[in-house]
């Protein structure tokens, strides 16, 4: 290559006037956080405060009732899932503040960001279990009278947690820390490298199992429940049903942006402008999904206030009232015609 005109190049975008420190950002604007990141930080802060305190309170209230009240078991497990996810927030918050720099190591990178996905799967599987329970109470009251017990509820929760852990494994396995050369930064993210098909498969499975299929089945489930409830013109309180419907609805609302951007990114070329734009919105979508981790206690309190008329009781007793309502009286195993009628009336509005 001796014949190449190998002179000092004119880079155009380089000049010789200043020096650049090792830690100086590559462009002048990168000292300030982007608007989506600032919004994500605000959401993370609120979610952490409300989520930790709210879910701790829910756990405290329901833990005492879980031995005898099945509803308490459901809400206890949901609160534990949310509480666990909230514990990762200070680390995620710190990372965003440092322009997504990840100084916490590889193990933390695999575990902490995966907690929100564990929460997603645990929550939706628990909500599916709760919804199945509501469905059976309305349509199979006699079966519930005979078999619906705390033991079965705990088994159902254990299955939900086990499945959630299994479904979170792909995300966990593909999370890696990458140390970028310039600007000097350690990043925590998923790297499928050669396997774009696997990346798409993971995104599709996440969308289908964590969103579309539950959305379809739960919509059908609650359509039937609500139709039956309205047709029977329920005389007793529908508070548990209302709370569960609100929790289910919030799940889908807050996971929607994450799921949409996730599936889009898996099908886009990583260097395309759309992909890069979506990547900038990633933290905001994650933070929006994280609202799920603090919304349930808020729903319970709002529901409790609604049922009380105004906030007369203390917060724990208000929550206890909402979360530990028992749907089936299990005093008698002998069924007469009148007992069955009573049962139907008691469960038609749950």
């Amino acid at each position: 290559m001796d014949s190449f005109n190998y002179t000092t190049p004119d880079y155009g975008h380089y000049d010789d006037k200043d020096t650049l420190d090792l830690n100086t950002p590559v462009d002048k604007t990168s000292n300030t956080l982007r608007v989506p990141d600032i919004l994500a930080l605000v959401i993370f802060a609120v979610v952490f405060l409300v989520g930790v305190l709210g879910n701790a309170l829910v756990v405290w209230v329901t833990a005492f009732e879980a031995k005898r009240t099945i509803n308490a078991i459901w809400f206890l497990n949901l609160a534990v899932a949310d509480f666990l996810s909230c514990l990762a927030l200070p680390i995620l918050f710190t990372s965003i503040v440092q322009h997504h720099h990840w100084p916490f190591g590889g193990a933390a990178c695999s575990i902490l960001p995966s907690l929100i996905l564990l929460n997603m799967y645990a929550s939706i599987l628990l909500l599916a279990t709760i919804s199945a329970d509501r469905f059976l109470l309305v349509f199979k009251p006699i079966w519930c009278q005979n078999f619906r017990g705390a033991g079965l509820a705990w088994i159902a929760c254990a299955v939900a947690w086990g499945l959630a852990l299994l479904l979170t494994i792909p995300s966990f396995l593909y999370r890696v820390v990458r140390e970028e050369y310039f600007p000097p930064k350690v990043l925590c993210g998923v790297d499928y490298s050669h396997d774009k098909r696997r990346e798409r498969a993971v995104a599709i499975v996440r969308l289908v199992l964590g969103f579309l299929w539950p959305l379809l089945t739960l919509t059908i489930c609650y359509t039937f429940i609500l139709l039956r409830t309205w047709s029977r013109r329920a005389t007793r309180s529908t508070k548990t049903l209302k709370v569960v419907v609100a929790v289910v609805a919030s799940f889908f609302i807050f996971w929607l942006p994450y799921q949409v951007t996730g599936i889009m990114m898996s099908f886009l070329e990583p260097s395309s402008p759309t992909f890069l734009l979506l990547k900038k919105l990633d933290s905001l979508c994650v933070s929006f999904a994280y609202i799920n981790c603090c919304i349930n206690p808020i729903i319970y309190v709002v529901a409790g206030q609604g049922f009380q008329g105004r906030l007369r009781k203390s917060l724990p007793s208000l929550l206890r009232n909402v979360l530990t309502e028992e749907s089936v009286v299990r005093e008698s195993k002998s069924f007469t015609r009148s007992t069955v009628d009573t049962m139907a009336q008691k469960t038609q509005a749950v």
Epitope: T8, Y14, L22, V26, R178, Y181, D191
Partner: antibody, heavy 125, light 112 residues
Amino acid sequence: QVQLQQSGAELAKPGASVKLSCKASGYTFTNYWMHWVKQRPGQGLEWIGYINPSSASSKYNQKFKDRATLTTDKSSSTAFMHLSSLTYEDSAVYYCARVPLPYGSSYGPYFFDFWGQGTTLTVSS
Amino acid sequence: DVVMTQTPLSLPVSLGDHASISCRSSQSLIHSNGNNYLHWYLQKPGQSPKLLIYTVSNRFSGVPDRFSGSGSGTDFTLKISRVEAEDLGVYFCSQSTLVPLTFGSGTKLEIK
């Protein structure tokens, strides 16, 4: 024109230390990072690390972190690499190479635009 | 570390032929800013390497337009449209997205 003039060939014993130099001319020394690259006979290239002459901050390949020390002398526009605890595997040609730096631009110091002619280090007892 | 795999190791060509060298990385080289920091160097016998292509497809100052680069993520290619005698030597791909910076094992372009 840009020149990176490296010191002459070195012969050292196993366990000894050596200090290689790279004198820069034809550009503002403090505006370019200086990298060091190793090439063993008939083999590929291996990155050792870099130094920012302006701030004296440096970054090393973990593989060389304990044995390589990069320094600069701004007054003479010279970069140095001190290599300690030499082994036979250290026998190689060592290159210094500069990278252009960005100012208010999205381009970074990502490629070696000029290389020194190389210094041959032979480790032999 | 990112492993850079070059193929072929040796590429015998006739002058005026087209030549293509492939470089594959063990990890994605897409930087958080969207760029792929993949570069190509040519080393002639007894000389130091010289920069040909930077950031996948940008020809360095003085490099003829018969050299072109392409690729993204993990798969990259250097193409020489009409090989000339001065193009012979060992071609190295190199990545500077991640630390440590790494190089391919080299592809020797030689006369058939």
